[in-house]
Interface confidence: low
């Protein structure tokens, strides 16, 4: 056998090159046939009326033909025949790859609430072979569940991803990425997650700056509430008691002038949005006015636990006065 061919893989719409090569030529006739065994070329003559076939090279040792604008119907075995005695035959298989026609990502809902499980689907239509779909949340790879539908040698792949969302996912892309032999580089589509979450509330003491509240002083607290959507209502209440007469409420700020011991207690900032509500407590302890001129030294320690409880402990260095817990977030 001195007739050789090579298999060809080509992307739909591109050019396939078929080559019949003869090792020890004796000027025998070379012929190329299509999968239906119709003659495409007999030596350098093309009897088949398909102008997509063009002669690239003809000699006693090679018949080389190009097929432009390849379609899936061109797939199959192409036969090279060499009319020696006895005749020789060799075949080359053309495999046509079809990239996915369309890549669609479908998210169950545009806006999700933290803790909710949402379904995301990605569909790669009409490819050959079937497409592999990979999922990413940001740069984290997730495993989806794929279903393959075959129709007329073409495959449509739908991958389903079940995703439990958290507030950290807000603004993070969900990426559907396709892997297919007919696709070079990255073929992907993405949607950015929009996650709504209940407020996180934090109380900031804006006055006095050194953090120690004494009789006669003023106190100003600012309530910071962050959520999505942004909290619609931020309110101050005094737990288990009426708000002092001399307290002034201005939006997120609580101002108490001329503090006295009767103001001792827990002051709560509450914030809510459509997802839920949360609060943070500030425990006010009013100390005696200073007896000496130098101000006392103050130590502030902040401890954060995984339950987002923030404790601010103020310790007065003067003997006889114990530190008190000042703010707790919920």
């Amino acid at each position: 056998q001195n007739l050789f061919t090579k298999d060809v893989t080509v992307i739909e719409g591109e050019v396939a090159t078929i080559s019949c090569q003869v090792n020890k030529s004796d000027d025998s006739v070379i012929q190329l046939l299509n999968p239906n065994r119709q003659t495409i070329y007999f030596r350098d003559f093309r009897p088949l009326k398909d102008s997509r076939f063009q002669l690239l090279n003809f000699s006693s040792s090679e018949l080389k033909v190009s097929l432009t604008n390849v379609s899936i119907s061109d797939e199959g075995r192409y036969f090279c025949q060499l009319y020696t005695d006895p005749p020789q035959e060799s075949y080359t298989t053309i495999t046509v790859l079809v990239p996915p026609r369309n890549l669609m990502i479908d998210i169950q809902k545009d806006t999700a609430v933290e803790g909710e499980e949402i379904e995301v689907n990605c569909t790669a239509m009409a490819s050959k072979p079937a497409t592999t779909i990979r999922w990413f949340k940001g740069n984290t790879e997730l495993k989806g569940k794929s279903e393959v539908e075959e129709w007329s040698d073409m495959y449509t792949v739908t991958s389903q991803l079940m995703l439990k969302v958290h507030k950290e996912d807000d603004g993070v892309p969900v990426i559907c990425q396709v892997e297919h032999p007919a696709v070079t580089g990255n073929l992907q589509t993405q949607r950015y997650l929009e996650v709504q979450y209940k407020p996180q509330v934090h109380i900031q003491m804006t006055y006095p700056l050194q953090g120690l509240t004494r009789e006669g002083d003023a106190l100003e607290l600012t309530c910071e509430a962050i959520g999505k959507p942004q909290p619609v209502m931020v309110t101050w209440v005094r737990v288990d008691d009426e708000m002092p007469q001399h307290a002034v409420l201005s939006g997120p700020n609580l101002f108490i002038n001329n503090l006295n011991k009767t103001d001792n207690g827990t002051y709560r900032c509450e914030a809510s949005n459509i997802v839920g509500k949360a609060h943070s407590d500030y425990m006010l302890y009013v100390y005696d006015p200073p007896t000496t001129i130098p101000p006392p030294t103050t130590t502030t320690t902040t401890t954060t636990t995984t339950t987002t409880t923030i404790l601010t402990i103020i310790t007065d260095s003067r003997a006889g006065e114990e530190g008190s817990i000042r703010a707790v977030d919920h």
Partner: antibody
């Protein structure tokens, strides 16, 4: 040749804020997600956080939230660190992160926290 | 929290095959990566997506992931393979993190 170089590591006292910078050469930072990872002396690797190419969104390890901030310009990725303690003493690496795989790492920059 | 467990140290004779393991409760749902780190050097990616090897990494290194265990296999261990090896995974199921490293395994090549 694609490479990353970190800078800004030095000896600081506890509580001093510090910003580290990661500079890329041979590729455009804008196209890639970028991560910061640290390694305390004699210890293992610890992921700090990642900034995404598309939205510029950041995601942090739970212990890093609030104290560490990652930001990005067209040529650098910064790691801003606050409320530093001796436990934050480590070599800090930046890495090019492509869909969860840290493929290119910088040589690292040493941060020492000591009073 | 999600923890990847690796043996602290493993020994192998020169030229032998060694398997380094990495276990976690839900590792079967995640893809594992492996990194090699030599003293005073940055880590180098060896394996990603459980089994894929970047160009330039010798085919002596291979990866697998089944059940709750990811495995890095080094066949024909060489003196230059002496290093720390870290497994890592991205985990998209929780809200607290999405990337975690194992504690690392120190590989010693003897003989």
């Amino acid at each position: 040749q694609e490479q990353l170089v970190e800078s800004g590591g030095r000896l600081v006292t506890p509580g001093t804020p510090l910003t580290l910078t990661c500079k890329a050469s041979g590729f455009s930072l804008g196209k890639y997600d970028m991560s910061w990872v640290r390694q305390a002396p004699g210890k293992g690797l610890e992921w700090i956080g990642t900034i995404y190419a598309g939205s510029g969104s950041t995601w942090y390890a739970s212990w890093a939230k609030g104290r560490f901030t990652i930001s990005k310009t067209s040529t650098t990725v910064d790691l801003k660190m606050t409320s530093l303690t001796t436990e934050d003493t480590a070599t800090y690496f930046c890495a090019r992160d492509f869909l969860g795989v840290n493929s290119i790492w910088g040589p690292g920059t040493l941060v020492t926290i000591s009073s | 929290s999600f923890v990847l467990t690796q043996p602290a140290s493993v020994q192998v004779n020169l030229g032998q095959t060694v398997s380094l393991t990495c276990t976690a409760d839900t590792l079967s749902r995640s893809y594992a990566s492996w990194y090699q780190q030599k003293p005073d050097q940055a880590p180098v990616l060896l394996i990603h997506r459980d089994t894929s090897r970047p160009s330039g990494v010798p085919d002596r290194f291979s990866g697998s992931n089944s059940g709750n265990t990811a495995t890095l296999t080094i066949s024909g261990a060489q003196a230059g393979d002496e290093a720390d090896y870290y497994c890592a995974t991205s985990d998209g199921s929780g809200s607290n993190f999405h990337f975690v490293f194992g504690g690392g395994t120190q590989l010693t090549v003897t003989g």
